[in-house]
C-alpha cells in the first residue's frame, strides 16, 4: 500500500516566493521620472522576476525630522496621488503581485522614528495601518526598529491590527542589528512578524561560517517562518564581491523562508561602479542610457536589457531560481538539513514528503574544491542518492540535466550547484 501523503502546511502568499524592495521610486525609474504612475509601467518587469510582493516606499509626506510636516496618510505629491496609488494596487493585483507599503515615519531624516515622543508616533502608525489596509495594501514594512523604544510591544499592537484585518496581511520589521539575541527578542512577542536584519551581512566568505549562521538562526527560531536577506534595505553589492552574488542568490532562494531582495540585486547593481550615485539607492540600470552622467560608464552586461538577452547572466539566474522557488514543494515548504561537505563548503538538502528533492552545494572559497558529502549527518528521511541531476550551476559550462555522481562532486571557485533527485521509498 502506498505511504500516506504528508499534510500540506498552510501557505501564506509571502511563503511562495521572493519580495522585491523599491525603497526609492526615483532611483528605480531613473530619467527624472519616479512616480507611482511610472512604477505601474514596470509591473510587467516585476512579473518576469516572478516575485510575489513589492515592498514600496516610503512614499508618504515627510519633511526631514519634522513631525509637524509628516503625514502617514498623505502621499508625497512628488510620487503622485492617492488615485495613482489605487491604480497601481489594482494593476499589481491583476498581475498577482502583492503591495507592501513602507511606513517608516521619518525616512528622510536622521532618526527614522524621530527623537521625540514615541507614543504619539506609534499611535499615529496604528491609524495609518488601518487607513492603508482599507485602501487595499497587502502589508507593511517598518525599518530601523532598533530606534523605536519598546519596539516589541508596538510591533505586537501593529501586528494585531494587520492580522485583525486579515490573516493574509503581512508586517515586516527591519533592523540594522546583526545580533541574534536582539533579533530573537524582537521575534519573541510577534508570532507572524517577518524580520529583515543584517544578521547574514557579516557571513564573510567562508562556507563554514555561513553554515553556522544559518543553522544557528534556524535552530533558534524553531519552526517559525524566516526571511532571508543581507540587510533591511541595502543592495547585495554593498556586502558582497561580484563573484559571490550568484552564490548568494542561489542560497537566498533555497533556504527555508522568504527571500527579500532590493531592486537591482537581480542584475548585480553596484553603486560603487556608478560615480556620484548614492550607496543606498543608485539609479537602476534599465539600459545603457540609464546613467548618462559619464558616457561609457555603463556597459550592456550591467543592464536589465543586456542581461535579459543573455541566458548566462545574473538576471537569468535570478529568474530561474525565482521560478523554481515558487513551484517546487520542497523549496516552498520543505524540510531543511545542513550537512558537512568539507572545508569551505556549505551544503544542505530541501525535501518534502514524496516530492522531488533538492541538494544545494555552495563553494564560498576562491579555489576549486572536491565535495566530501557526509550523508551520515542526515536523517533517514533525507538520505542522499548516489547520483543527482544538475538543475543549475552558478557558473557557465556545466551540462544541465546531466546526472552527477555525488561522491565525485567537484566545485569551481565561488560555484554553487542546485541538484535534484527523486524521492526513494
Amino acid at each position: 500500500r502506498a505511504p500516506r501523503c504528508r499534510e500540506l502546511p498552510a501557505q501564506k502568499w509571502w511563503h511562495t516566493g521572493a519580495l522585491y524592495r523599491i525603497g526609492d521610486l526615483q532611483a528605480f525609474q531613473g530619467h527624472g521620472a519616479g512616480n507611482l504612475a511610472g512604477l505601474k509601467g514596470r509591473l510587467d518587469y516585476l512579473s518576469s522576476l516572478k516575485v510575489k510582493g513589492l515592498v514600496l516606499g516610503p512614499i508618504h509626506k515627510n519633511q526631514k525630522d519634522d513631525v509637524a510636516q509628516t503625514d502617514l496618510l498623505q502621499i508625497d505629491p512628488n510620487f503622485g496621488s492617492k488615485e495613482d496609488f489605487d491604480s497601481l494596487l489594482q494593476s499589481a493585483k491583476k498581475k498577482s503581485i502583492r503591495v507592501i507599503l513602507d511606513l517608516t515615519p521619518n525616512y528622510r531624516g536622521e532618526n527614522s522614528w524621530f527623537s521625540t515622543q514615541v507614543d504619539t508616533v506609534a499611535t499615529k502608525v496604528k491609524d495609518a495601518l488601518e487607513f492603508w489596509l482599507q485602501a487595499g495594501v497587502d502589508g507593511f514594512q517598518v525599518r530601523d526598529i532598533e530606534n523605536l523604544k519598546d519596539a516589541s510591544s508596538f510591533l505586537a499592537e501593529w501586528q494585531n491590527i494587520t492580522k485583525g484585518f486579515s490573516e493574509d496581511r503581512l508586517l515586516i520589521a527591519g533592523t540594522n542589528s546583526s545580533d541574534l539575541q536582539q533579533i530573537l527578542s524582537l521575534l519573541e512577542s510577534n508570532k507572524d512578524l517577518l524580520l529583515t536584519s543584517s544578521y547574514l551581512s557579516d557571513s564573510g566568505s567562508t562556507g563554514e561560517h555561513t553554515k553556522s549562521l544559518v543553522t544557528q538562526y534556524l535552530n533558534a527560531t524553531g519552526n517559525r517562518w524566516c526571511s532571508w536577506s543581507l540587510s533591511q534595505a541595502r543592495l547585495l553589492t554593498s556586502f558582497l564581491p561580484a563573484q559571490l552574488l550568484r552564490l548568494y542568490q542561489l542560497m537566498l532562494f533555497t533556504l527555508p523562508g522568504t527571500p527579500v531582495f532590493s531592486y537591482g540585486d537581480e542584475i548585480g547593481l553596484d553603486a560603487a561602479a556608478l560615480p556620484g550615485q548614492p550607496m543606498e539607492a543608485p539609479v537602476m540600470l534599465w539600459d545603457e542610457s540609464s546613467f548618462p552622467d559619464i558616457p561609457g560608464a555603463v556597459s550592456a552586461n550591467m543592464t536589465v536589457k543586456g542581461q535579459s538577452e543573455d541566458p548566462g547572466s545574473l538576471l537569468s539566474l535570478f529568474r530561474r531560481l525565482s521560478d523554481q522557488r515558487s513551484k517546487e514543494r520542497s523549496l516552498l515548504h520543505g524540510d531543511f538539513h545542513a550537512f558537512s561537505a568539507g572545508p569551505g563548503l556549505f551544503s544542505y538538502i530541501r525535501h518534502w514528503d514524496q516530492n522531488e528533492r533538492f541538494l544545494v552545494v555552495l563553494n564560498f572559497g576562491d579555489v576549486g574544491l572536491s565535495a566530501g558529502l557526509q550523508a551520515s549527518d542526515l536523517p533517514a528521511s533525507a538520505s542522499l542518492p548516489a547520483k543527482a541531476d544538475l538543475l543549475l550551476s552558478t557558473q557557465p559550462g556545466r551540462e544541465e540535466g546531466s546526472p552527477l555522481e555525488l561522491e565525485r562532486l567537484k566545485l569551481e571557485p565561488h560555484e554553487g550547484l542546485l541538484l535534484r533527485f527523486p524521492y526513494a521509498a
Epitope: 513631525v67 509628516t70 521625540t116 507614543d119 504619539t120 487607513f131
Partner: antibody, heavy 120, light 107 residues
Framework: DVQLVESGGGLVQPGGSRKLSCAAS????????MHWVRQAPEKGLEWVAY????????YYADTVKGRFTISRDNPKNTLFLQMTSLRSEDTAMYYC?????????????WGQGTTLTVSS | DIQMTQTTSSLSASLGDRVTISCRAS??????LNWYQQKPDGTVKLLIY???RLHSGVPSRFSGSGSGTDYSLTISNLEQEDIATYFC?????????FGGGTKLEIK
C-alpha cells in the same frame, strides 16, 4: 469648508442614557480620526474619547470608560457618543473635534458644541 | 496622566499690548503642545500646534515657543477680537490633557 455640527444634548436624569451625534462635512470623513471633548460649566476642557477613521482604534478617558461608547457611520459622515449610567458630573458642553492626520497630533477643527444636563 | 498647568487663570491687557500666556507640563512633552482659543460664545479654534506652528488662517500676531515642560503663547499686538479664553493641550500621550485655561480681558 470643514464643518462639524453636534446635536442630541438636553436634560437627562441621573442613571439615564443619551446619544450625541456630530454631522461632518467639507472633508473626507473616513480619513480622519475624531474626538469628543467636553467642558463642564465654568471649568476647563476635558478629552473624552477618540475613534480612528475606520473604527479600529478607540480610546476613552478613565472617567467615562465602560459607560460611554464612541462610534461612527462613515457613509453618513456622522460621529456618535452613546452615553449610559449618566451622572451629574457628566453635565457639560460636548464638542466633537477632528484629529489632524499629521504626526504632530492636534484637534484641528471643532464643532460648536451641544449641551448635556444630567439632573433630577 | 500628564498634568497641564496654566498658572494665570485670568489676565487683563490693553489693545496693542504684547501678551504672553504660559503653560507647564508635569513631564517632558517633546514639543507636542497645542494652543486653542475659546470665544465667549463657546466656539473653539486651534491656533498653534506642535509648540510654534501656526494653524491655517490664524493671524501672524499669534506665536508659540517653548520646549521640554515649559511653553508659552504670545499675542504681539492685542486686538479686540482676541478677547477669549486660551487653553494649552498636550498631544504627547493618551489621555490628551488640557490646561485650566487663561481668560484674557481688556483693561
Amino acid at each position: 469648508d470643514v464643518q462639524l455640527v453636534e446635536s442630541g444634548g438636553g436634560l437627562v436624569q441621573p442613571g439615564g442614557s443619551r446619544k450625541l451625534s456630530c454631522a461632518a462635512s467639507g472633508f473626507t470623513f473616513s480619513t480622519f480620526g475624531m474626538h469628543w471633548v467636553r467642558q463642564a460649566p465654568e471649568k476647563g476642557l476635558e478629552w473624552v474619547a477618540y475613534i480612528s477613521g475606520g473604527s479600529t482604534n478607540i480610546y476613552y478617558a478613565d472617567t467615562v470608560k465602560g459607560r460611554f461608547t464612541i462610534s461612527r457611520d462613515n457613509p453618513k459622515n456622522t460621529l456618535f457618543l452613546q452615553m449610559t449610567s449618566l451622572r451629574s458630573e457628566d453635565t457639560a458642553m460636548y464638542y466633537c473635534a477632528r484629529e489632524t492626520t499629521l504626526l504632530a497630533t492636534n484637534f484641528d477643527y471643532w464643532g460648536q458644541g451641544t449641551t448635556l444636563t444630567v439632573s433630577s | 496622566d500628564i498634568q497641564m498647568t496654566q498658572t494665570t487663570s485670568s489676565l487683563s491687557a490693553s489693545l496693542g499690548d504684547r501678551v504672553t500666556i504660559s503653560c507647564r507640563a508635569s513631564q517632558d512633552i517633546s514639543n507636542y503642545l497645542n494652543w486653542y482659543q475659546q470665544k465667549p460664545d463657546g466656539t473653539v479654534k486651534l491656533l498653534i500646534y506642535y509648540t510654534s506652528r501656526l494653524h491655517s488662517g490664524v493671524p501672524s500676531r499669534f506665536s508659540g515657543s517653548g520646549s521640554g515642560t515649559d511653553y508659552s503663547l504670545t499675542i504681539s499686538n492685542l486686538e479686540q477680537e482676541d478677547i477669549a479664553t486660551y487653553f494649552c493641550q498636550q498631544g504627547s500621550t493618551l489621555p490628551r490633557t488640557f490646561g485650566g485655561g487663561t481668560k484674557l480681558e481688556i483693561k
